[in-house]
């Protein structure tokens, strides 16, 4: 006489909310004589599924007639599944007896896991911006998802990033799962238009996976550059200081002019130029009148860029011993 | 797919303006730079200058600055090269071009351009 | 403005032929060289960047290269779908130029 085998053939299976799910569960003898039922779980605590011979299982239908004298089908459809649903299904062997059928023997079990998409992910930059060859942290983050397993990637301008970690939670049994990942990148000065990706891929994706991006001009300042020219003496005295601003991000700047340590003039960055890597460049004039100079006059420029500290360039517009002299003759 | 699709030929006096348009579908518009390139009948390519849709941001050759202006609608993404005065020399294939990436590299921020339109042919005849 | 010269202008080769064009630049580039075929009536195609990197979708019988002012392309065994004109480009600095091209006819 063939020994009973009870056969649930798939370990795993993934259903998605409102789907039906069938769980297959065959037996290769009619022997001994009694039913088979189905529960979740294992131990006292275990839930009974479907019951043919009493109960009221709505949800449930089975697949084969039972009713068959010779049926070794047990398999069953769980429709509409929430996710409530999730767990390990056994379909159990029990041996007719008096006053009580007796458990005979149970399947491997099946376990039945939600199939849900994760949501799109979301990537968030720094707090505050930093400078070129610094590194900043980016963090991207997916939930919703189940079965657990999934992978994330990073990228800066589609290139693998290798520097981050990531994180799944809950660690144990969950209906559904979050991710979070947070990848470090240095900061090129280069960097103002280019963009980090996370990108997540999930079995519920069939290989077309979710990409969250986000731009890292939101995430780096580059200090300016500073260039201050003296133009030759013209017609009247009179000296053009141009002062250039090269090379910064993002474009709020103020400059401010001291002659001899006093403020002659304030400006905010206004018409400037934008460089093809996004950089921006400014360029002010001041008109200096050199006549009625007795000294040499000391002429700074003060850049305050994003709120950083002021940066100071100066520059010593000699008088000549002529003017010198004549400005003292003036006074007497 | 990414395609650039370009408006129709046009036929223009000397003097006058022309405004070629230039629609992008099938990637982020405002990405990656469109450059202009012309071709006159049986000559080689010539480069005219290229825009930042994002920014807005242009750069031309230096022989066409003053008389072309390029700009963007970024809500039909669409990118227009206007010049004006036009003079028969100007008789060309009009080609806009996406760059091949839309980030800089520590060595540049120009690319070569790997996505065509059809051509434009503007004809100036008096 | 970087000149870019491109020989020879014109060439005549068979089907199966290895074809050779070569583009110097008036100044060292790197290697920010395109190269791109143009058939009568169409748009110019990307081929190589970089000098030597095959474009997406681009056989693998195009292949480039050099570095600085000295560059290459090459059709290893020309085909009846080859029969264009080439043009190198060199992206290091604005303006963006192109050589004068180079005509492949049928023999």
């Known amino acids: 006489e063939e020994e009973l085998q009870m056969i649930q053939p798939e370990k795993l299976l993934l259903v998605a909310v409102g789907e039906s799910a069938t769980l297959n569960c065959t037996v290769t003898s009619l022997l001994p004589v009694g039913p088979v039922l189905w529960f979740r779980g294992v131990g006292p605590g275990r839930e009974l599924i479907y019951n043919q011979k009493e109960g009221h299982f709505p949800r449930v239908t089975t697949v084969s007639d039972l009713t068959k004298r010779n049926n070794m089908d047990f398999s069953i459809r769980i429709s509409s599944i929430t996710p409530a649903d999730a767990g390990t299904y056994y379909c159990v062997k029990f041996r007719k007896g008096s006053p009580e059928n007796v458990e005979f023997k149970s399947g491997p079990g099946t376990e039945m896991a939600l199939r849900a998409k994760p949501s799109a992910p979301v990537v968030s930059g720094p707090a505050a911006r930093a400078t070129p060859e610094h590194t900043v942290s980016f963090t991207c983050k997916s939930h919703g998802f189940s079965p657990r397993d999934i992978t994330l990637k990073w990228f800066k301008n589609g290139n693998e990033l290798s520097d981050f970690q990531t994180n799944v939670d809950p660690a144990g049994q969950s209906v559904s799962y979050s991710i979070r990942s947070t990848a470090r990148v240095v900061l090129a000065p280069w960097d103002v238009r280019s963009q980090v990706t996370c990108e997540v891929a999930h079995v519920t994706l069939q290989g077309d996976p979710l990409r969250g991006t986000a731009n890292l001009s939101e995430a780096i300042r580059v200090p300016p550059t500073l260039e201050v020219t003296q133009q030759p003496m013209r017609a009247g005295n009179q000296v053009n200081i141009t002062y250039q601003v090269r090379n910064f991000y993002p474009q709020n700047l103020q400059l401010t002019w001291l002659e001899n340590g006093n403020v002659c003039r304030t400006e905010t960055a206004s018409t400037l130029t934008e460089n093809k890597d996004g950089t921006y460049n400014w360029t002010s004039w001041l008109l200096v009148n050199t006549s009625d100079q007795r000294d040499d006059v000391v002429l700074t420029c003060q850049v305050k860029h994003d709120g950083q500290l002021a940066v100071n360039k100066s520059l010593v517009l000699e008088v000549s011993a002529h003017q010198k002299d004549q400005s003292s003759d003036a006074t007497h | 797919q990414v395609q650039l699709v370009q408006s129709g030929a046009e036929v223009k006096k000397p003097g006058a303006s022309v405004k070629v348009s230039c629609k992008a579908s099938?990637?982020?518009?405002?990405?990656?730079?469109i450059n202009w390139v012309r071709q006159a009948p049986g000559q080689g390519l010539e480069w005219m200058g290229w825009m930042n849709p994002n920014s807005g941001n242009t750069g031309y050759a230096q022989k066409l600055q003053g008389r072309v202006t390029m700009t963007r609608d970024t809500s039909t993404s669409t990118v227009y090269m206007e010049l004006s005065s036009l003079r028969s020399e100007d008789t060309a294939v009009y080609y806009c071009?996406?760059?091949?990436?839309?980030?800089?590299?520590?060595?540049?921020?120009?690319?070569?351009?790997?996505?065509w339109g059809q051509g434009t042919l503007v004809t100036v005849s008096s | 403005d970087i000149q870019m010269t491109q020989s020879p202008s014109s060439l005549s080769a068979s089907v199966g032929d290895r074809v050779t064009i070569t583009c110097r630049a008036s100044q060292g580039i790197r290697n920010d060289l395109g190269w791109y075929q143009q058939k009568p009536g169409k748009a110019p195609k990307l081929l190589i960047y970089?000098?030597?990197n095959l474009q997406s979708g681009v056989p693998s019988r195009f292949s480039g290269s050099g570095s600085g002012t000295d560059f290459t392309l090459t059709i290893s065994s020309l085909q009846p779908e080859d029969f264009a004109t080439y043009y190198c480009?060199?992206?290091?600095?604005?303006?963006?130029?192109f050589g004068g091209g180079t005509k492949v006819e049928i023999k």
């Open positions: 480009q060199q992206s290091y600095d604005v303006p963006l130029t």
């Open positions: 071009a996406r760059e091949r990436v839309g980030y800089c590299s520590s060595t540049s921020c120009l690319h070569p351009l790997d996505y």
């Open positions: 970089s000098a030597s």
């Open positions: 099938g990637y982020t518009f405002t990405r990656y730079d």
